[in-house]
């Protein structure tokens, strides 16, 4: 078959990084700067993504890949292919309509983006809180009271916080 | 950073050969083109050709296809040039430099290339 | 081939003063020229990509414009640091090309 489809078309015998030119007697051509083609036997080479603005060069457009951006330092890709790119925010915060927000009280995000998760509930486990979150950190559950029988342990539960769930200043 | 550190300065006989090197760091070697460029004293950039070295792809200008040779060797993250037939004209600096579709962003220091009997 | 002529080869101005470099292509190119400066005995730095695109780490004096076959760059106010060569690069089409340069120097 593919025998047969040269014969018949010349383009299909054009690697990848090339076009048919049918300006030149469908001789294959190289794709232009700024232009690829990833599979053989095409007529036109596509055009490059330009990785401007928020978006910066990752990977160069090549003859047979296109470019590949990522974003400038304070943000980061979302979508496909970094299709986006979101502002990055501190631990402790995540983005709103309004901008970098601070974790309401009983959540918390350990990353620059995503949103404030809440902190784990130790008692769902039978467990106490070993240390207090914070608005960077979640929670750590210890053994639940029951485990802490006398002599068993050297844990000693933590003393309670002034404000509950965040750590003494 | 990145940065490209380009081989010594080489003093050769006409009609031999030299291989020029262009060692980068700092970035992903294989994701941009490395452009070869030759000034000589007191004249203009000439550009001589590029290779993209994830896949070897080399580009030259007419004046150049027989004269250089641009190769890449991935496990050291360095660009090659060699030129061959060597004669007077061919003295000149040599620069590599990454970066291509959008301007070369970073240049080597050059190589001085002197050839003479 | 695409030539690239830049003119004039020498351009002599005093501090302070706004300059502009030509540089023509022998057909049309789009966006896809590039400016280049480089001081005696020292490797070229990009000053400006794609005709007008800025670079990070560049003086924001210089500025670049045109499309097609006429694009210029401009100096807004120079400084005797800027004393160097310049020179234009195609991207548009194989092979790329640099076009001949203008030097500048201080009256």
């Known amino acids: 078959f593919e025998r047969t489809r040269s014969l018949q078309d010349p383009c299909s015998n054009c690697p990848a990084g090339t076009f048919c030119d049918n300006n030149r007697n469908q001789i294959c051509s190289p794709c232009p700067p700024n232009s690829f083609s990833s599979a053989g036997g095409q007529r036109t080479c596509d055009i490059c993504r330009q990785c401007k603005g928020v978006f910066r060069t990752r990977k160069e457009c090549s003859s047979t890949s296109n470019a590949e951006c990522d974003c400038t330092p304070g943000f980061h890709c979302l979508g496909a292919g970094c299709s986006m790119c979101e502002q990055d925010c501190k631990q402790g915060q995540e983005l709103t309509k309004k901008g970098c927000k601070d974790c309401c009280f009983g959540t918390f995000n350990d990353q620059k983006r995503g949103i404030c998760r809440p902190w784990t509930n130790c008692s769902l486990d039978g467990k106490s809180v070993l240390v207090n979150g914070t608005k960077e950190r979640d929670v750590v559950c210890g053994p639940s009271p029951a485990d802490l029988s006398p002599g068993a342990s050297s844990v000693t539960p933590p003393a309670p916080a002034r404000e509950p769930g965040h750590s003494p200043q | 950073q990145v940065q490209l550190q380009q081989s010594g300065a080489e003093l050769t006989r006409p009609g031999a050969s030299v291989k020029l090197s262009c060692k980068a760091s700092?970035?992903?070697?294989?994701?941009?083109?490395i452009q070869w460029i030759k000034q000589r004293p007191g004249q203009g950039l000439e550009w001589i050709g590029t290779?993209?070295?994830?896949?070897?792809?080399?580009r030259y200008t007419q004046k150049f296809k027989g004269k250089a040779t641009l190769t890449a060797d991935k496990s050291s993250s360095t660009a090659y040039m060699q030129l061959s037939s060597l004669a007077s004209e061919d003295s000149a600096v040599y620069y590599c430099?990454?970066?291509?579709?959008?301007?070369?962003?970073?240049w080597g220091q050059g190589t001085t290339l002197t050839v003479s009997s | 081939d695409i030539l690239l002529t830049q003119s004039p080869a020498i351009l002599s101005v005093s501090p302070g003063e706004r300059v502009s470099f030509s540089c023509r292509a022998s057909?049309?190119?789009?966006?896809?020229i590039h400016w280049y400066q480089q001081r005696t005995n020292g490797s070229p730095r990009l000053l400006i990509k794609f005709s007008s695109e800025s670079i990070s780490g560049i003086p924001s004096r210089f500025s670049g414009s045109g499309s097609g076959t006429d694009f210029t760059l401009t100096i807004n106010s120079v400084e005797s640091e800027d004393i160097a060569d310049y020179y234009c690069?195609?991207?548009?089409?194989?092979?790329?090309?640099f076009g001949g340069g203008t030097k500048l120097e201080m009256k």
């Open positions: 057909q049309s190119i789009g966006a896809s």
């Open positions: 700092g970035y992903t070697f294989t994701n941009y083109w």
């Open positions: 430099a990454r970066g291509l579709l959008e301007g070369a962003h970073y």
């Open positions: 690069q195609q991207t548009n089409s194989w092979p790329t090309a």
């Open positions: 290779i993209y070295p994830e896949n070897g792809d080399t």
